[in-house]
């Protein structure tokens, strides 16, 4: 290009469809210059124009020769340029922000602009830069890139930005520019100019204000507070901690809190002070709701479902900021909300959901929501398998007969489609409780009935009941206890009977024991005693309870005595016993000793004894008839332990073992014995029958049985030199070598001669008796031998 000719040809495009080419005019040319621009392409095109630029349709790929001829007063000049797409710059039009708005409550800016995509021939990627500035001094706060695509039509774009500082605190400015990253264009691509700036500001009134107000944020977050003030702010505190002031426009200030701590339930105070005033806001720092823990749904009545859960980690947010819960059932689309007034019981929350007709499977989602977030738990439940029945109420007991009762109770709910397993606790006084399980068909009307058999007549029972469903989820709580006395029945057995002849042998005394309650089957009112022989039966008058003895004058013929117990319902079977004993000539008296509390008696099996054995016992020192008590044991027994509260150690008892056949008893063994042997309480009385110069003859008496207190096993006789009323040691003092002891084990021996003594010498004699229970006290005597003749 010659100097003085058009030069510096440059082309730009803003839409890829039209190139705007411009050049510099030759030096020295004035306004009146015309140009002829010729473009060498398929068809040679020339354009006449009066300005130094030309808009031409975009040229396809390749080099093009552009000739610019300038025609002016003092001649013409021509320049030739080679033009290629690569020499063209793509500079988008300056964008325009259509709208900038703000949500002050969330400190969010909303931006809206048009990409003017309709002027572009192809789809292209666009990069937008959005610049956010703050304060009158327009400090850059944020530079953001935002990607969109041109799609051949004008598209509105929206973008939002949440400010870390409340928007009320300072004016905020926004500008945008764009860069079109077209794959179809090989030239230079450049950023557009920045759009005209738009701003958002809060219109303060004359009042001082602190922002944000009542904000709820996550523990650990950063947050900025500001005070919009006409007066100078002196200090700012969060809680009791002073914070450095960040100066904004005018007297306005801000503070930035990093990693905020959890708030108390009343929130955390943020306070700004001026010379004369104090201004505050409250921040609530807490947590989003934890996933509800241990979500469990069950029903008490198949009418409503009770769902319980534990809220998990505390959110530290209360009142209107507390977690709200919604229970959604997905099959039905029904939901219920947890009311905050329903305060949690023992840390767990609960909600009731009305059951739906013909729906057994429920898919529950429990949504937890607070200002910081949400969470959920899900549970799929077949509600017929999750029945936790109410406590049975109106529990009643009615008699059916003496061994059966009818139990009725109320269990609210509609259980027509399920079966119950109910557990009945049956407790007799002073016995182990019994539990019986019964299966009952569920009903709609809540009333239940069950019969209970195999009970004892005239027995006080305590009943209670609890129920679960047959598929078992949980037992209900136990009902109240009901005490009930079953009705009377005929006594099931005759009384345990014995007989003894009176001491003069003229009367037969019949004894019987009161029937145990489980055999009496009611209150025994009286007894009938009758006496029968082959010829006749004689009945005694009715004997009222509690008399358990009757006396009949009988001869020595054999009679069968019958005793019958009667209650209000009827009479027991008779107890029969023969008046006469079956003789037994082959009897020895044996000795037996017990084991402290009782006495073990054993015998050989005797197949002849067909009804039972009777052991009777009495205190051997008592007068006839000898009867203290008796015990019946079955005929297949060969031993028994006799125990009685009346047994005392050191007391001698007689025991008699009888065998029974055909209601007649034969004495099989006669025993004397002690439950426990003790030492004798007295010493034997002894006398000196004869003395000589070298011997003494001693004689003693038996100790009475009551004072013996055991079986006598022998005597201990001590003797040694000694005088009455002297300081010489007594015979039984230990350490004396001259004392002699004789152990007399022949208990029939009643005399003892002591020989080889010295004449005219005083001897101290001591006598003691002993049993297996110990040695008794001593009896002593002083004797002087005669002089040697």
């Amino acid at each position: 290009q010659k100097k003085g000719a058009p030069h510096d040809l440059k082309c730009v495009t803003n839409n890829l469809q039209v190139w705007d080419c411009y050049w510099k005019a030759p030096s020295g040319t004035g306004r009146g210059t015309d140009y002829e621009v010729c473009i060498e392409n398929r068809s040679h095109s020339c354009y006449q124009l009066e300005k130094t630029n030309i808009k031409i349709p975009a040229l396809s790929h390749g080099d093009y020769e552009i000739t610019i001829n300038s025609l002016h007063d003092f001649g013409s000049s021509t320049s030739k340029f080679t033009l290629n797409e690569q020499n063209v710059s793509l500079i988008p039009d300056t964008p325009e922000i259509l709208n900038l708005s703000a949500d002050f409550s969330t400190s969010t800016l909303y931006l809206k602009w048009n990409d003017r995509g309709s002027v572009f021939p192809h789809h292209s990627n666009v990069i937008w830069e959005i610049k956010i500035l703050r304060k009158e001094s327009m400090e850059l706060v944020k530079l953001v890139t935002h990607n969109t695509t041109l799609n051949g039509k004008d598209t509105l774009h929206h973008w939002s930005w949440a400010s870390d500082m409340p928007l009320e605190c300072a004016i905020h400015f926004v500008e945008i520019r764009c860069y079109i990253d077209s794959l179809h264009f090989s030239g230079r691509k450049e950023w557009s100019d920045w759009s005209p700036v738009k701003n958002i500001s809060w219109m303060p009134d004359s009042q001082t204000k602190v922002f944000p107000q009542d904000k709820v944020i996550l523990v650990g977050s950063d947050i900025t507070f500001c005070c919009i003030s006409q007066e100078k702010v002196l200090s700012a505190l969060i809680g009791h901690t002073n914070c450095p002031l960040i100066h904004l426009d005018g007297e306005n200030v801000a503070i930035k809190i990093h990693n905020i701590s959890v708030s108390a339930s009343s929130g955390t105070n943020v306070v700004f002070t001026t010379e004369d005033n104090i201004f505050g806001t409250v921040i609530f720092a807490g947590y989003p709701p934890d996933t509800p823990q241990q979500l469990n749904c069950e029903t008490h009545d198949l009418k409503e479902i009770l769902c319980r859960w534990n809220p998990g980690r505390a959110t530290a947010l209360v009142g209107p900021r507390a977690t709200s819960y919604t229970l959604l059932e997905s099959f039905s689309g029904k939901y219920v909300r947890f009311k905050r007034a329903e305060a949690p019981t023992n840390g767990s929350y609960q909600l009731f959901f009305q059951m739906l007709p013909n729906q057994e499977i429920y898919n529950f989602t429990l949504n937890a929501h607070n200002p910081l977030g949400r969470s959920e738990s899900t549970i799929l439940v077949n509600i017929t398998e999750k029945v936790y029945p109410h406590t049975p109420t109106s529990f009643k007991v009615k008699d059916i007969n003496s061994t059966a009762v009818k139990l009725s109770w109320h269990l609210p709910g509609n259980f027509a489609k399920i079966n119950f397993l109910c557990q009945i606790e049956i407790k007799k006084s002073n016995t182990v409780q019994e539990q019986r399980n019964v299966t009952i068909k569920g009903v709609e009307n809540s009333s239940y009935l069950v019969a209970l058999d195999k009970l004892n007549p005239y027995t006080v029972y305590t009943f209670r009941i609890r129920c679960s469903t047959e598929t078992f989820w949980k037992w209900s709580k136990w009902s109240n206890k009901k005490q009930h006395l079953t009705t009377e029945a005929i006594p099931s057995k005759g009384p345990d009977t014995w007989r003894e002849w009176s001491s003069d042998g003229k009367n037969l005394i019949i004894y019987w024991k009161p029937l145990p309650i489980n055999e009496a089957n009611g209150k025994i009112l009286s007894y009938n005693v009758s006496c029968s022989s082959d010829e006749e039966t004689q009945s005694l008058s009715e004997i009222p309870d509690p008399q358990h003895k009757a006396e009949i004058q009988l001869d020595k013929n054999d009679y069968i005595i019958s005793v019958v117990a009667k209650n209000s319902v009827g009479s027991s079977p008779p107890s029969k016993i023969a008046s006469m004993e079956i003789p037994n000539d082959d009897l020895k008296i044996e000795q037996v000793v017990g084991m402290g509390k009782g006495i073990l008696l054993t015998w050989h099996y005797d197949p002849n004894m067909t009804c039972d054995y009777v052991i009777k016992w009495c205190n051997s020192s008592r007068s006839e008839p000898c009867l203290m008590d008796w015990r019946k044991v079955p005929s297949n027994s060969t031993e028994t332990v006799i125990e009685s509260d009346q047994f005392r150690p050191g007391v001698r008892y007689n025991f008699f073992l009888y065998g029974c056949r055909n209601q007649g008893y034969q004495l099989l063994r006669s025993m004397i014995g002690y439950i426990e042997e003790l030492a004798p309480t007295v010493a034997p009385n002894f006398t000196v029958e004869d003395t000589s110069a070298d011997s003494i003859l001693v004689k003693w008496e038996d100790i009475p049985v009551e004072e013996l207190r055991g079986f006598l096993r022998g005597y201990l006789f001590y003797f040694g030199k000694g005088e009455r009323d002297t300081s010489k040691m007594r015979v039984l003092e230990s350490g004396r070598s001259d004392i002699k002891v004789k152990n007399i084990t022949d208990i029939s021996q009643k005399t003892l001669r002591i020989a080889d003594l010295q004449g005219k010498t005083s001897y101290h004699l001591v006598l003691r008796a002993y049993t297996d229970g110990g040695v008794g006290p001593e009896k002593s005597m002083y004797v002087v031998t005669k002089e040697n003749s």
């Epitope: 009343s266 929130g267 306070v271 005033n277 505050g280 009142g319």
Partner: antibody, heavy 122, light 108 residues
């Protein structure tokens, strides 16, 4: 139990001074902000002044600023209100009141004394 | 300063009735800083509600508070004979702390 007992009220001429005291007991006085609130005869409540728990800051109603001074002696568990340049419109029952929250700065008033009457009259 | 207005000035109701008392602020008040007090003749005020909705210790649950921004309400669900008194609202979020003029609840 918390007790606040005001004293020092009485009849005073306009332009003169008066000092009210409030004896506190039953709580940790040094941990609570304290306020004075007044009530003119037959009228509503008017907040007068507040002092922080540690005495570091004091704030006043516009109507008394520059004339009244609130102070406290934490060792004596006592709150004071020094009233200078009294005016007829200062005639009221003056209540001292404790702020609800332990150690907090902006608090509702949960315990009040029975009040002491100040009459400003010539 | 923040001006609080209360309405109605007087509320005449029967025991067992429901009382709804209104408090309006001249500018937005943080709900955390709004309280209600009850005052009976010859007695000091008594704190009922703080933080707009939290009941003070020992206050029966027939008293409840609600509201935010500039409009707040105190509700007494079933008036008992001892509830007839004057009720004041107070903002304590920015000084000067201000009270409303009070609402007198008297027996109809």
């Amino acid at each position: 139990q918390v007790q606040l007992v005001e004293s020092g009220g009485g009849v005073v001429q306009p332009g003169r001074s008066l000092r009210l005291s409030c004896a506190a007991s039953g709580f940790t006085f040094s941990s609570y902000g304290m306020d004075w609130v007044r009530q003119a005869p037959g009228k509503g409540l008017e907040w007068v002044a507040v002092i922080w728990y540690d005495g570091s800051n004091k704030f006043y109603a516009d109507s008394v600023r520059g004339r009244f001074t609130i102070s406290r002696d934490n060792s004596q568990n006592t709150l004071y209100l020094q009233m200078n340049s009294l005016r007829a419109e200062d005639t009221a029952v003056y209540y001292c009141a404790r702020e609800l929250w332990f150690g907090e700065l902006l608090s509702p008033l949960d315990f009040w004394g029975q009040g002491t009457l100040v009459t400003v009259s010539s | 300063e923040i001006v609080l207005t209360q309405s109605p000035g007087t509320l005449s109701l029967s025991p067992g009735g429901r009382a709804t008392l209104s408090c309006r602020a001249s500018q937005s008040v943080s709900s955390s800083y709004l309280a209600w007090y009850q005052q009976k003749p010859g007695q000091a005020p008594r704190l009922l509600i703080y933080g707009a909705s939290s009941r003070a210790t020992g206050i029966p649950d027939r008293f409840s508070g609600s509201g935010s921004g500039t409009d707040f309400t105190l509700t007494i669900s079933r008036l008992e004979p001892e509830d007839f008194a004057v009720y004041y609202c107070q903002q304590y979020g920015s000084s000067p702390f201000t009270f409303g003029p009070g609402i007198k609840v008297d027996i109809k």
